[in-house]
Amino acid sequence: QDSRGCARWCPQDSSCVNATACRCNPGFSSFSEIITTPMETCDDINECATLSKVSCGKFSDCWNTEGSYDCVCSPGYEPVSGAKTFKNESENTCQDVDECQQNPRLCKSYGTCVNTLGSYTCQCLPGFKLKPEDPKLCTDVNECTSGQNPCHSSTHCLNNVGSYQCRCRPGWQPIPGSPNGPNNTVCEDVDECSSGQHQCDSSTVCFNTVGSYSCRCRPGWKPRHGIPNNQKDTVCEDMTFSTWTPPPGVHSQTLSRFFDKVQDLGRDYKPGLANNTIQSILQALDELLEAPGDLETLPRLQQHCVASHLLDGLEDVLRGLSKNLSNGLLNFSYPAGTELSLEVQKQVDRSVTLRQNQAVMQLDWNQAQKSGDPGPSVVGLVSIPGMGKLLAEAPLVLEPEKQMLLHETHQGLLQDGSPILLSDVISAFLSNNDTQNLSSPVTFTFSHRSVIPRQKVLCVFWEHGQNGCGHWATTGCSTIGTRDTSTICRCTHLSSFAVLMAHYDVQEEDPVLTVIT
């Protein structure tokens, strides 16, 4: 005890009353009002507790402090007096803060700020919604994925910030009268091929597909190495020339020079050059057959092989090239007698007649085109008199029935067994290469050298053998009639044709040889 009679053991937050008693300081309380033992404590009174007599008034909060309390304005309110704290309701000057006015960018770009008592809310613009994790932040509504996609099925939905568009899909366009963008947009497929909006290379044909297009190699063309067919970027090359090369095992400088020319013409070939290229190939062939050079020194069988190879290749090349010609009739003739007649048409329903110096061909246009082939219909006839040199002594192989019939009406083959070629060799071709079994026959009228009396005249075609050579044959071809210098033939397939005179001695009048005019 000190000299003044005050207890020295008073607990924290208390003051002595006398030498034996203490009392808690204002704002603190103990179990009993007077503290008589040091074991007792003074605890802070929470003036802000519910049963407390303290009232701060509206728009304010009570904050308990050690031994006291403060009244402060609630968040979103501020004191008009400027005093940050106060003690009772009478000192309260709290009023609502207009946060929207204080900070115009409070709701960022896509909301409107609305002041409320003590706070604010963000009202989102159309096309936006409040973010669940941040109710004050407006975020874009993706109409395209939210299940409220209002676009027509012919369009695709494009989400924009705060909006959406219904756009035509690539390769589609708005139907007449329809907009392109609003939710009432309706689209239809664009035919890029007919509208010229395609990027197909000139070596391809454009095919329209739903919403797009593809580029396919032209007939007789193949995709360039490593480039797939039927793509937008397909580029093709002409197969016409690549396959027509000298026959294996034949050594002839004259023939090599001819094929060098063919390959040269193919190297920088373009569809627009078809006419010139056809003429140049036939010019080169005409020159080759006019001056065969070392070809004439080859064994007969090899000459027949060369002829077979030339006829076969020429047909393929002319078919391929003529598909790039424009509609109309073409006639070319060359110094040594080679002649080409060609008619190109979009398919028409009539018969076609091609006339040449020494041959006339008549057939039905419907034969010309393979179904589904988009290209023009082509009918062609080439007369190649010079081929006769290479086909001298070529064998004739008759069907067993014809062989028997000939033996019944004729005494048999005379000593020199090879038939004589009376006419020019002609080659007929169509844009359709499937000509082994024509639905209606083709008729040829040949002008030729005079027939020796009592000799058998036969309409023949060149059959390309398995060995790459070939022989004359009559299968599918019949002699309709013959007179001294002309013969009419009818065949059910196309190939290279001629009229032969077989060395048979006719014993009596043969009804087959009756002249039909």
């Epitope: 000139s202 040269d264 013409l265 190297r267 373009k270 627009g272 140049s280 010019q283």
Partner: antibody, heavy 118, light 106 residues
């Protein structure tokens, strides 16, 4: 009749570019290669390259790749050659000519003289 | 590339004289063409496809050859034939010309 009309003479500074034109008439422009040939004074003929107007395809001699650009405008039947980064050795007469493998160059323009001088 | 070598580089001939010039190719060529050029004018196609005369070319001119060896002949020289003659091939890219043969009137 077939005619190839070339643009007029050009005088250009080193480093500049010139674009020469060759207007075709009297035939189907898209059906033939258009050749471009250079001839320096007192020298022979030198092939630059060719453009096929039908599809814009070009071929060029190695020496002129990067130097000359060949194009064709189907709508006006005109072939163009742009020569860039001009130097004194580009001073020459430039001819356009219609060409086909088997026929050679059957029709020629009158030539355009290009002079490069500082 | 195929190199075309023309010989002679320069030659002269009197009127009525036969003239022959040659064009030798470094590789085989299948289409050979010849052009005539007079000073200050554009070249003119003179012979194409080895031996075919271009339109308007007198028949005293002829061409022949094959493979790597080609020739150009004037049966009887005339004053108007004095010019430079070039051979040209397009059998392989790049297209090439010979350096030319200058034919002068003696």
């Amino acid at each position: 009749q077939v005619q190839l009309q070339q643009s007029g003479a050009e005088l250009a500074r080193p480093g500049a570019s010139v674009k020469l034109s060759c207007k075709a008439s009297g035939y189907t422009f898209t059906n033939y290669w258009m050749q471009w040939i250079k001839q320096r004074p007192g020298q022979g003929l030198e092939w630059i390259g060719a453009v096929y107007p039908g599809d814009g395809d070009t071929m060029m001699t190695q020496k002129f790749k990067g130097k000359a650009t060949l194009t064709a405008d189907k709508s006006s039947s005109t072939a163009y050659m742009q020569v860039s980064s001009l130097a004194s050795e580009d001073s020459a007469v430039y001819y356009c000519a219609r060409g086909f493998t088997a026929y050679g160059m059957d029709y020629w323009g009158q030539g355009t003289s290009v002079t490069v001088s500082s | 590339q195929i190199v075309l070598t023309q010989s002679p580089a320069v030659m002269s001939a009197s009127p009525g004289e036969k003239v022959t010039m040659t064009c030798s190719a470094s590789s085989s060529v299948s289409y050979m063409h010849w052009y005539q050029q007079k000073s200050g004018t554009s070249p003119k196609r003179w012979i194409y496809d080895t031996s075919k005369l271009a339109s308007g070319v007198p028949n005293r001119f002829s061409g022949s050859g094959s493979g790597t060896s080609y020739s150009f002949t004037i049966r009887s020289m005339e004053a108007e034939d004095a010019a430079t003659y070039y051979c040209q091939q397009w059998s392989s890219n790049p297209l090439t010309f010979g350096a030319g043969t200058k034919l002068e009137l003696k």
